[in-house]
């Protein structure tokens, strides 16, 4: 059996080397001479030769200083043989533990740590964490037990101890009130990590703390009084630029200005913010009326995009806006005039009078009237009075010029101001219907097949309006009923079904169809009918030789 005491060896030993560690014995040495050898890491495998054994005495020796941080434990095997080379023991595992010396100082994981904290943060607020590591043994010794401290703070304002560090975790926290970005936007701390719980080897790093902005400064008008002028009637015109300063961080919501007009109930003005320099741009939101009011005194307040973090006074400015008089166009009253008139209204008669008012009450001006748009050339106007008459017959069914029974004309009124100003009025003639159109069939050209012909639907169209339209009456005339029949397709009698009474030869036929509206206005229309060489529904008509007869019925 082996006799091997526990083996440990301190790192960084001075020597001299080789140095005895322990004496290994096999109790087989009582039976005869025993020779010892070792194998394994540090003996015959890299790093080779760190450990040796005296062949005859069994003294295990170390040949050089050890480094625990490189290899903390060596695993060797001891061997014992007799003089003839035969093994007298099974190999035995030997563990050599390298004991730690405090030969490594802590190392911060970064040279510079960066953190941030809001200005005005309460004491106790965690800011950031610094971390250091130590290669020494932290299980059996305090050689890697790191304690953190703050060595210095720059600037030492408003207090030399604005921050504290948790000596165990490296968490940096606020300890003193008074962080103010506008006064001290950054702090640089020199932090120390020392092993042996703060009493041993040490190293330093830098913690840079950025104090982030809160909205603790109001925007302030400078100056607080402004003057501007604007022509009447013009919207979106810049009147003046308002200037503010804000000590908070530029281009952040705590700096960006929001302007509010305190006494603009009519919503006549608007202040927008110039995103580049925070100026307030005062503009007209709608046209102002010189005749109603010649001067406005506006009170403008300025705040930020985000609310104030603390109780702050809101800055206000006074803006005096003078409205400038401008020659304004005459205004038609009403701007759109509707007149009902029958489409058979007599030519040369006055339909209506359409006049404009002069808004410039401070100027005496004469108004002249002209027709600006009259696409059908139906109207004329008296330039002095604005009386409008017909110059040609009206026609409700002129669908090129009349939409939904309405004819639209534009009238202009021009004053003699400087410069001349022109106003426009819209005249809507609502044309009432006269029964001046008879019904007509649609389509007028019809195709049938020679064999088994499919009846064809014919729609009845009347350009007039009810009651001058359906129900319609249809009748075949001039002997057409001999070969053809018609019947109403629906109760409104707005369409009919035409079909031949008998088999017809291929060829072209003309059918006279009399249509009459509800007011008995009638008209005879000739239908062009082709009988084709086909069966059923007529598609593309392949005609046979045309029938010689002129009018076939």
């Amino acid at each position: 059996d082996w006799v091997i005491p526990p083996i440990s060896c301190p790192e960084n030993e001075k020597g001299p080397f080789p140095k005895n560690l322990v004496q290994i014995k096999s109790n087989k040495d009582k039976e005869g001479k025993v020779f010892y050898s070792i194998t394994g890491q540090g003996a015959d495998t890299p790093p080779v030769g760190v450990f040796i054994i005296e062949r005859e005495t069994g003294w295990l020796k170390v040949t050089e200083p050890l480094d625990r941080e490189r290899i903390a434990t060596y695993t060797l095997f001891s061997h014992a043989v007799s003089s003839n080379g035969n093994a007298v023991e099974d190999p035995m595992e030997i563990l050599i533990t390298v004991t730690d010396q405090n030969d490594n100082k802590p190392e911060f994981t970064q040279e510079v740590f960066k953190g941030s904290v809001m200005e005005g943060a309460l004491p106790g607020t965690s800011v950031m964490e610094v971390t250091a590591t130590d290669a020494d043994d932290d299980v059996n010794t305090y050689n890697a037990a790191i304690a953190y401290t703050i060595l210095s703070q720059d600037p030492e304002l408003p207090d030399k101890n604005m921050f504290t560090i948790n000596r165990n975790t490296g968490v940096i926290s606020v300890v003193t009130t008074g962080l103010d970005r506008e006064s001290f936007p950054t702090y640089t701390l020199v932090v120390q990590a020392a092993d042996l719980q703060g009493e041993g080897l040490s190293t330093t790093a830098t913690a840079v703390i950025t104090v982030t902005d809160t909205n603790d400064n109001p925007p302030i008008f400078n100056p607080t009084t402004y003057k501007g002028q604007v022509p009447e009637n013009e919207a979106n015109v810049v009147i003046t630029t308002l200037k503010v300063t804000d000590a908070d961080a530029p281009n952040t919501p705590a700096w960006e200005a929001v302007y509010t007009i305190l006494n603009d109930d009519g919503g006549q003005f608007v202040v927008t913010t110039n995103p580049v320099n925070n100026d307030g741009i005062l503009k007209t939101a709608k046209g102002l009326d010189f005749e109603a009011k010649q001067q406005y005194i506006l009170h403008v307040a300025v705040t930020n995009v985000v609310p104030f973090e603390v109780s702050l006074t809101t800055s206000t400015a006074t803006v005096t806006v003078d409205v400038l008089d401008v020659n304004e166009a005459p205004i038609f009253v009403p701007p759109e005039k509707r007149v009902e008139v029958s489409e058979d209204f007599g030519v040369g008669q006055e339909i209506t009078s359409y006049t404009a008012q002069e808004p410039d009450t401070f100027m005496e001006q004469k108004i002249t009237y002209r027709i600006w748009r009259d696409t059908a050339n139906w109207l004329e106007i008296n330039p002095d009075t604005g009386a409008i008459s017909t110059r040609a017959e009206l026609d409700r069914e002129d669908f090129e010029h009349v939409k939904n029974s309405t004819y639209t004309a534009l009238i202009i009124a021009t004053d003699n101001g400087s410069p001349v100003a022109t106003g426009t009025g819209t005249l809507l003639l609502i044309l009432s219907d006269v029964n001046d159109n008879a019904p007509i069939p649609e389509p007028r050209t019809i195709f049938f097949c020679e064999r088994n012909p499919k009846p064809q639907v014919i729609n009845i169209i009347d350009a007039d309006l009810p009651p001058n339209t359906s129900p319609f009456t249809a009748e075949l005339t001039h002997g057409a009923s001999a070969n053809w029949t018609i019947q109403y397709n629906d109760p409104t009698q707005e369409s009919i079904i035409l079909k031949p009474k008998m088999a017809l030869e291929v060829g072209d036929y003309k059918i006279n169809l009399k249509l009459m509206d509800n007011q008995n206005k009638d008209q005879v229309t000739t239908l062009e009918v082709s009988v084709c060489d086909c069966e059923g529904a007529a598609g593309v008509c392949r005609k046979a030789q045309p029938v010689e007869a002129g009018l076939q019925i």
Epitope: G124, T125, T164, R167, N168, T177, V310
Partner: antibody, heavy 117, light 111 residues
């Protein structure tokens, strides 16, 4: 000499409200965080609420969160504690205290708040 | 339950020395050198006796001293006098909120 003087305590029914004030003198009020600490009869000290020097940051103990509001008027050198929805367990002497150098110092003389029906 | 642990009571005769302990954690007492001790007489407000572990404010007798080892802080009063009879509270700065935690208080009786 730094001085703090509380007022506003009294008897109030459960569910009622009170507003405590703390008038400060002898130091630059706006430069210091302030706290309210309470002490129930025969009990220890309990931190209630705190506010930063500017008034921009506030803290409340869980036991009063949503019911109490701390504020300050730096122009009047006065700290306030608005107490709503008061409960019997809010019965205590309420102290205001100045925070500096990692500690609360000095303390006011205290004002008694009794919540009882 | 208080965050810091103090003995409920201690006593001593005039002229003797007594020590009051205050045990916290590695996140408060053990982490920062911001341990304070307050004296409170019945019906009065707390008065700061020791700040930053061992600093005495002006006007506080040098019979009062403070120390700290690991997670435990101590207040020692030497040459005990009758007027020292009071409740004593320890407090410590702590990261996060609240910024300060209190002990449950120790009643000192001068025999």
């Amino acid at each position: 000499e730094v001085q703090l003087l509380e007022s506003g305590g009294g008897l109030v029914q459960p569910g009622g409200s009170l507003r405590l004030s703390c008038a400060a003198s002898g130091f630059t009020f706006s430069s210091y965080a302030m706290s309210w600490v309470r002490q129930a009869p025969g009990k220890g000290l309990e931190w209630v609420s705190a506010i930063s020097g500017s008034g921009g940051s506030t803290y409340y103990a869980d036991s009063v969160k949503g019911r109490f509001t701390i504020s300050r008027d730096n122009s009047k050198n006065t700290l306030y504690l608005q107490m709503n929805s008061l409960r019997a367990e809010d019965t205590a002497v309420y102290y205001c205290a100045k925070w500096g150098d990692g500690t609360l110092n000095p303390w006011g003389q205290g004002t008694m708040v009794t919540v009882s029906s | 339950q208080s965050a810091l642990t103090q003995p409920a009571s201690v006593s001593g005769s005039p002229g003797q020395s007594i020590t009051i302990s205050c045990t916290g954690t590695s996140n408060d007492v053990g982490a920062y050198n911001y341990v304070s001790w307050y004296q409170q007489h019945p019906g009065k407000a707390p008065k700061l006796m020791i700040s930053e572990v061992n600093k005495r404010p002006s006007g506080v007798s040098n019979r009062f001293s403070g120390s700290k080892s690991g997670n435990t802080a101590s207040l020692t009063i030497s040459g005990l006098q009758a007027e020292d009879e009071a409740d004593y509270y320890c407090s410590s700065f702590t990261s996060g909120l609240p910024w300060v935690v209190f002990g449950g208080g120790t009643k000192l009786t001068v025999l």
